[in-house]
């Protein structure tokens, strides 16, 4: 009599998560009498997947009726496959007894599960950086299988090359994770820029997943300052303006100092936005020239986004003509606490 063989024709089967898998198994003889059981894995830690005689296996059904006379097909159908179902499945023939005795095992079928990667999540630096500095962005995606995956970085549609990618774990696993860190050199024009992390995987059928981050969250463009004065219609008044240009983000505190003493403080409010996403703002003082002697220095001090203050000074220019317009009564003492009129726009 020919020795019984357990045949598992497929060495491997690959299915997409959520679908069903069929694992084929046939035996070459009806003798000896005894059941077939399916296991995942081998050795003492193997896991019983299907046993016709007993047990509750809600996701497993036999392809043919195993109770039918002369049945030699013991293939099974597993529904709603998840990555956790991956592994090597063995169809095992037992000889009937008390207990049943294991007689022969099939060669095993490796079930691999294709699972889509999660939507990539891009995170940027925790602190802002200024133009010409390099910042790092991290992209993460999880839960995919098989391990092969392609990740690309783009900045405003241009592919980046300075990045490092790791896929974990290194060995065989039910599912994998990818983490990539890209280095981006900031420019003054990057307020409107965007970085994109693009993930391509066999399960996505050529339609990659994308995660984005705005460089506006990562950049700080420091302002440039200019202080100048203009005469006003009233001959004893001049307008001293502090022009704050090309800064980002909006958070700005401006302080006027008169000969080093704080005169007034303002928070930037009505800003003008430039095409590149940066902002401009101006603050002005209405100065009574009669209330000042020569040698008054006005300083515009700007604290931007919590950074150390930058300042620009201007020596008040009072013409001889303006001095002539001032009567002795309006000139006041040199150290008189004459707070200048202020305004902004």
């Amino acid at each position: 009599e020919e020795e019984l063989q357990v045949i598992q024709p497929e060495k491997s089967v690959s299915v997409t998560a959520g679908e069903s898998a069929t694992l084929n198994c046939t035996v070459t003889s009806l003798i000896p009498v005894g059941p077939i059981q399916w296991f995942r894995g081998a050795g003492p830690g193997r896991e019983l997947i299907y046993n016709l005689k007993e047990g509750h296996f809600p996701r497993v059904t036999t392809v043919l009726d195993p109770t039918k006379r002369n049945n030699m097909d013991f293939s099974i159908h597993i529904s709603n496959i998840t990555p956790a179902d991956a592994g090597t499945y063995y169809c095992v023939k037992f000889r009937k007894g008390s207990p049943d005795v294991e007689l022969k095992s099939g060669a095993g079928t490796e079930l691999s599960v294709r699972a889509k990667p999660s939507a990539p999540v891009v995170s940027g630096p925790t602190a802002r950086a200024t133009p010409e500095h390099t910042v790092s962005f991290t992209c993460e995606s999880h839960g995919f299988s098989p391990r092969d995956i392609t990740l690309k970085w783009f900045k405003n549609g241009n592919e980046l090359s300075d990045f490092q990618t790791n896929v974990d774990p290194a060995g065989k696993s039910v599912s994998y994770s990818i983490r990539s860190t890209a280095r981006v050199v900031l420019t003054r024009r990057d307020v409107h820029s965007q970085v994109i992390c693009e993930v391509a995987h066999v399960t996505l059928q050529g339609d990659p997943l994308r995660g984005t981050a705005n460089l506006s969250e990562a950049i700080r463009v420091p302002p440039t300052l200019e202080v100048f004065q203009r005469p006003m219609r009233a001959e004893n008044q001049v307008n001293v303006t502090c022009q704050v240009r090309k800064f980002y983000p909006q958070r700005l505190l401006l302080t006027w100092l008169e000969n080093g003493n704080v005169s007034q403080t303002e928070t930037a409010s009505t800003l003008t936005e430039n095409k590149d996403g940066t902002y401009n703002w101006r603050s002005w003082l209405l100065v009574n020239t009669c209330a000042h002697r020569d040698g008054v220095v006005l300083t515009c001090q700007v604290e931007h986004d919590g950074q150390p203050a930058v300042s620009k000074s201007h020596a008040l220019e009072v013409s001889a003509h303006q001095k002539e317009q001032c009567s002795d009564t309006t000139s006041g003492p040199v150290l008189a606490p004459t707070a200048p009129l202020g305004g902004s726009g």
Epitope: A42, G43, P169
Partner: antibody, heavy 122, light 112 residues
């Protein structure tokens, strides 16, 4: 080429807990059993226990109450914790890979770490 | 637990000559599937053990063909057809049929 590397303290005080980690490089945790075996000075090999890739553990009955083997597939590592150690636990501790192809038994411990010497002393 | 017993415990050998080590198990290692769960290991001085033979008679990868395993049930033999100087060390048999995995006491092979 799969390689195993044990790491952990070489000296443990009596009654304290021995903790060792084995890092698997160049291969997969899946489909194998991951074993700890020890060898007291001048003596033979003693199996402590192993863990299957699916998380199922098996221990030497005389050590079962003191031993825990765990697996971290994300780091490709497995670990041994042994509580209430005594001088009798002084040994070279090996981590090893055990193969299983089919059936109920196993097919040889085919990859071994270089071993780490653990001395239990106050 | 399955008890493994080796003999001899010490084996002086001459390079180029054959050698053999016996191993006996307290119960049969021949499983109902026809597979024998018996392995042989060599631990060279100062090194980790290495697998020589698994399944009673299958040579592990990279093991020279001068090593062969035989036997069935409870009695097993490891043969070295021509001993070489690098074969010195302690040879262990081990069973892998059931937990706990158990090993023999070891046979120390040294050059005469």
């Amino acid at each position: 080429q799969v390689q195993l590397q044990e790491s952990g303290p070489g000296l443990v005080k009596p009654s304290e807990t021995l903790s060792l980690t084995c890092t698997v490089s160049g291969g997969s945790i899946r489909d194998y059993y991951w074993s700890w075996i020890r060898q007291p000075p001048g003596k033979g090999l003693e199996w402590i226990g192993f863990i299957y890739y699916n998380g199922r553990t098996f221990y030497q009955s005389s050590l079962k109450s003191r031993v825990t083997i765990s697996l971290d597939t994300s780091k490709n590592q497995f670990s041994l914790k042994m509580t209430s150690v005594t001088a009798a636990d002084t040994a070279v501790y090996y981590c090893a890979r055990v193969r299983a192809y089919s059936g109920i038994g196993l097919d040889g411990t085919d990859v071994w770490g270089q071993g780490t010497t653990v001395t239990v002393s106050s | 637990d399955i008890v493994m017993t080796q003999s001899p415990l010490s084996l002086p050998v001459t390079p180029g000559e054959p050698a053999s080590i016996s191993c006996r198990s307290s119960q049969s290692l021949l499983y109902s599937t026809g597979y024998t769960y018996l392995d042989w290991y060599l631990q060279r001085p100062g090194q980790s053990p290495q697998l020589l033979i698994y399944g009673g008679s299958s040579r592990a990868s990279g093991v020279p063909d001068r090593f062969s395993g035989s036997g069935s049930g409870t009695d097993f033999t490891l043969k070295i057809s021509r001993v070489e100087a690098e074969d010195v060390g302690v040879f262990y048999c081990g069973q892998a049929l059931q937990t706990p995995l158990t090993f023999g006491q070891g046979t120390k092979v040294e050059i005469k």
